[in-house]
Interface confidence: low
């Protein structure tokens, strides 16, 4: 019968920082130079041997004279309590098939980490422990005096634990959060009654969880250096040098080379000239608590990020075409580049792609004359597109061309004794049609009754009108816009010898917020179109004169413009244009885009005051210059009489007082006799005009006292 191989020489050492017990032992009676498979059962007790807190088996192959090692980590700091360890063994080897049995237990080995030294009566453990956010942590206090009441606080909030013995209480902190990089404060305070006996604190360093680097990528711009970048995520550095920021290491598996990166989010890798094409990089992030890694495998030629093109130029620039040229940094022989061109101008953007070798060239056509363009180019590897380079760009301006459209021309004709005064207006050509800076306008006046007679007036830009005094003949007027290159087509207008101001009734119209909707009867005979012109009724016609051309088959239009202001009256005239370009006035219209209430009240005179009546008149009140069509007047009258006069009706004023009101519906009726009055009586009146938008402003009443019957005024 074999002797059981009892473990002997059990020694237990501790590592306070790791909270671990390290066991060492040997097995006597092992056959010399023989290996045996054995199982060791380990028992760990806390505070007293009977309080077994952990039992486990450890299997290993044992050699003669071998010192065996095994470690165990305690969730409770070792300083908190005495631990006891013992061990027994069992042979579990095929060489000994007969039933085996456990050896005796070794004697208990007592382990005590004494950090509760000195005169202090209270201790808190562990000190300065480093853990990761979300882990569970056990802390404890050791109190010398069991009469003391001890309270513990985590960041100022009281925590409650489990008493292990009269001196020791442990606290389980579940899933500890990161609070600050200078650590989480835990305090315990011992007191008897209301008297504090002392306080102890520890700092628990909670690290944020190290993240896997994101967006890891490498690329080259010259086949000499690989530039690798990544998003490092949260910095896990802690204060008091407890944990520095995580480090990053690049490892390339094909070459077996490794590089510690000095930056937190990028690293350069020297490409050796040994024609290595495929790279397998592992980026390792590491702090004191864990490692994280991410991998990329790529072919070097598929990761080319070119430097941006240079020497961008424009050649043979004319009014509508240009040649764009550029260079790219050559990085390898026989390299083909794909380049993208963007052309910005006149609010539009065009895009073109072109394949090149070293020097790029692109013909830009269908450009607008006299226009500033911004062209830019970027390039990439055409064979294995990885990503575009940065843009390189330049501005250029096309040359001018002759104006492409005739100016839009209209006129006002006023008859004076013996002649016509023609005020000619034209609109500036749009940028699209001016094709450059308009320098001057040529106005050619030709007398159609005397064909050989014509005059040329050259008017410098930016003038947009001119006044011509013509006799009672028919005239053809041409207006031509000129820039540095040439002249536009001519705009032709004919002034008839016949007076055109035949009596045409003016019609009132109502506008809307959107403008004015106009319609008219078609002109008999052939027309080439209609013209609607308009201006502010109250102003000098030259100040705010506008017109609109309408096609020959249209007899209505909407005039909408932001220039229409509420309370302003506009006059419209509608002309038909004959095939001979002679204008004929068809209709006149006037109205407000939005009527407002009158801006002022009339100045009222009191006439023929008698004991029974008086006359009110406001003859000088102008109805024309008002912010709406005056529809009539309201006459308000106050007196001590309880009843209103005949023709008047009761009304309530805005201040709540009562009075009598009379309505005049004719805006030209500017007098009223107020009669049936009482002698020696006190009256008050107030007259205000009204439009569709309301009355004029409130004003004070004017006082009138009728004389006695015997007086004469």
């Amino acid at each position: 019968e074999r002797l059981p191989l009892t473990p002997v020489s059990l020694k237990v050492s501790t590592n306070s920082t790791r909270q671990s017990l390290h066991l060492q032992w040997t097995v006597h009676n092992l056959p010399y130079h023989q290996e045996l498979k054995m199982v060791f059962q380990i028992q760990i007790s806390r505070i007293e041997t009977s309080n077994v807190i952990w039992v486990g088996n450890y299997s290993t192959t044992v050699k003669w004279n071998q010192v065996l090692h095994w470690s165990w980590e305690s969730e409770l700091p070792l300083e908190c309590a005495t631990h006891f360890v013992r061990i027994k063994s069992l042979v579990d080897d095929a060489k000994f098939p007969e039933p085996n049995f456990w050896s005796n237990w070794s004697s208990w080995e007592e382990v005590s980490v004494q950090d509760s030294t000195g005169q202090d009566i209270l201790f808190v453990f562990p000190k300065d422990k480093l853990v990761e956010e979300g882990t569970n942590v056990t802390i404890c206090y050791v109190s010398r005096n069991i009469q003391n009441n001890v309270s513990c606080y985590l960041e100022g909030k009281q925590i409650h634990g489990e008493q292990l013995d009269p001196h020791v209480t442990a606290f389980n902190l579940n899933s500890v959060p990161f609070i600050r990089n200078k650590g989480t404060n835990i305090y315990c305070e011992a007191s008897q009654g209301n008297v504090s006996e002392g306080m102890k604190g520890i700092v628990l360093f909670v690290s944020k969880v190290l993240e896997e680097p994101k967006d890891f990528s490498c690329e080259t711009e010259d086949f000499k250096t690989l530039h690798c970048t990544w998003d490092p995520g949260t910095d896990t550095a802690l204060g008091w040098s407890k944990q520095p920021s995580q480090s990053y290491t690049l490892f390339e598996s094909f070459s077996g080379e490794k590089k510690l990166c000095t930056h937190k989010n990028w690293c350069n890798w020297q490409i050796t000239q040994d024609s290595q094409e495929t790279y397998n990089f592992t980026l390792i992030a590491e702090n004191y608590l864990r490692k994280r890694s991410v991998n990329i495998l790529f072919n070097l030629t598929h990761r080319v990020y070119l430097m941006n093109p240079f020497s961008v130029n424009f050649e043979n620039v004319n009014a509508t075409n240009a040649i764009m040229t550029w260079k790219v940094h050559s990085i390898r022989n026989n390299f083909t580049y794909l380049c993208q061109i963007e052309l910005h101008g006149e609010g539009k953007m065009m895009q073109y792609n072109v394949s090149i070798k070293v020097n790029g060239e692109y013909f830009l056509s269908e450009l607008e004359p006299a226009t500033e363009y911004m062209a830019r180019v970027r390039c990439a590897d055409a064979s294995h597109f990885w990503k575009w380079s940065e843009w390189s760009g330049q501005n250029f301006t096309t040359l001018e061309a002759a104006p492409s459209e005739a100016p839009d021309v209209w006129r006002i004709v006023s008859l004076e004794p013996g002649n016509h005064t023609v005020t000619l207006f034209w609109k500036p050509l749009s940028k699209l049609h001016a094709n450059g800076k308009i320098l001057f306008y040529n106005v050619v006046v030709e007398n159609l009754d005397k064909p050989s007679s014509s005059e040329l007036h050259s008017i410098p830009a930016p003038a947009n009108s001119t006044k011509l005094i013509l006799d009672r003949c028919s005239y053809q007027i041409c207006v031509i816009a000129n820039n540095s290159v040439g002249a536009s087509p001519a705009s032709v207008i004919v002034i008839s010898a016949d007076p055109e101001n035949k009596e045409v009734e003016e019609e009132r119209i109502a506008g809307t917020e959107g403008g004015f909707s106009l319609s008219w009867k078609p002109q008999p005979g052939d027309v080439i179109g209609y013209v609607v012109d308009w201006c502010d009724h109250t102003q000098d016609v030259l100040g705010d004169f506008q017109w609109k051309n309408v096609g020959p088959n249209t007899t209505s239009t909407v005039i909408s413009t932001d220039a229409f202001r509420p309370g302003v009256r506009y006059d419209f005239r509608i002309y038909g244009l004959s095939t001979k370009r002679i204008a004929c006035l068809l209709e006149k219209k006037t109205g407000y885009s939005q009527e407002l209430a009158p801006s002022d009240n009339p100045h009222v005179l009191v006439d023929t005051l008698t004991s029974h009546s008086f006359t009110l008149s406001w003859k000088d009140y102008s109805t024309e210059s008002q912010p709406g069509f005056i529809q009539g007047y309201h006459v308000y009258l106050k007196s001590k009489a309880r009843q209103c006069h005949p023709r008047f009706e009761k009304a309530v004023l805005s201040d709540g007082s009562e009075c009598c009101k009379y309505k005049i519906d004719n805006p030209e009726e500017k007098a009223l006799i107020v009669d049936n009055l009482k002698p020696e009586s006190f009256y008050e009146f107030f007259i205000t005009p009204f439009t569709s938008a309301g009355e004029g402003p409130s004003a004070t009443f004017t006082k009138v006292t009728t004389p006695d019957e015997h007086s004469s005024m």
Partner: antibody, heavy 118, light 111 residues
């Protein structure tokens, strides 16, 4: 080194306003709260309010609500305290103090004397 | 705003131990940490003790703080002439209108 430098002494009439500045240096301005504390002659310390230089949010002691405005300019690392409708009892030394995450005022300005009299 | 209550004065001879009390309520000292400030004549206050009993660097270890329930105390052991100053306790108050409250202040005289 870390320091808070306050603007100079002010003499004001009742009903007027005063604006005191406090320029921080030697640390990351937006990482610490700033408090304002005042001390009337021969009296104790009185807390007025707090500003978070990062977002600019403020909280004032109820006693000063409606009269005090605390602002900051991150480009110059400066906080300001404006007290309006001054009365004679506002005569005091006004301190700015840096507030730590553990609620203590670890760095104090040198103080600005504000005198209010007609 | 209700301040924390401190004795107006305390005194001792050089080398003696002096203790200053600070009384509050459940809404301030009872539920928050206590800080102590020293104000030498004509100067700005200086942080002496924070979080009930923690000393900032540079503060001699003869100064110690403690807290129990709704009261706190500051002890100066081995009193020295340069300790003659005003001492203030302080804490956040969690009442409806949260604010930072200071003690009424204690004048320490070295005899």
């Amino acid at each position: 080194q870390v320091q808070l430098v306050q603007s100079g002494a002010e003499v004001k009439k009742p009903g007027a306003s005063v604006k005191v500045s406090c320029k921080a240096s030697g640390y990351t301005f937006t990482s610490y709260y700033m408090h304002w504390v005042r001390q009337a002659p021969g009296q104790g310390l009185e807390w007025m309010g707090i500003i978070n230089p990062s977002g600019g949010s403020t909280s004032y002691a109820q006693k000063f609500q409606g009269r005090v405005t605390m602002t900051r300019d991150t480009s110059t690392s400066t906080v300001y305290m404006e007290l309006s409708s001054l009365r004679s009892e506002d005569t005091a030394v006004y301190y700015c103090a840096r507030g730590t995450t553990y609620d203590a005022f670890d760095i104090w300005g040198q103080g600005t004397t504000v005198s209010v009299s007609s | 705003q209700s301040a924390l209550t401190q004795p107006p004065s305390a005194s001792g001879t050089p080398g003696q131990r002096v203790t200053i009390s600070c009384s509050g309520s459940s809404s301030n000292i009872g539920s928050n940490t206590v800080n102590w400030y020293q104000q030498l004549p004509g100067t700005a206050p200086k942080l002496l003790i924070y979080s009930n009993n923690q000393r900032p660097s540079g503060v001699p270890d003869r100064f110690s703080g403690s807290k129990s329930g709704t009261s706190a105390s500051l002890a100066i052991s081995g009193l020295q002439s340069e300790d003659e100053a005003d001492y203030y306790c302080a804490a956040w108050d969690d009442s409806l209108n949260g604010l930072y409250v200071f003690g009424t202040g204690t004048k320490v005289t070295v005899l």
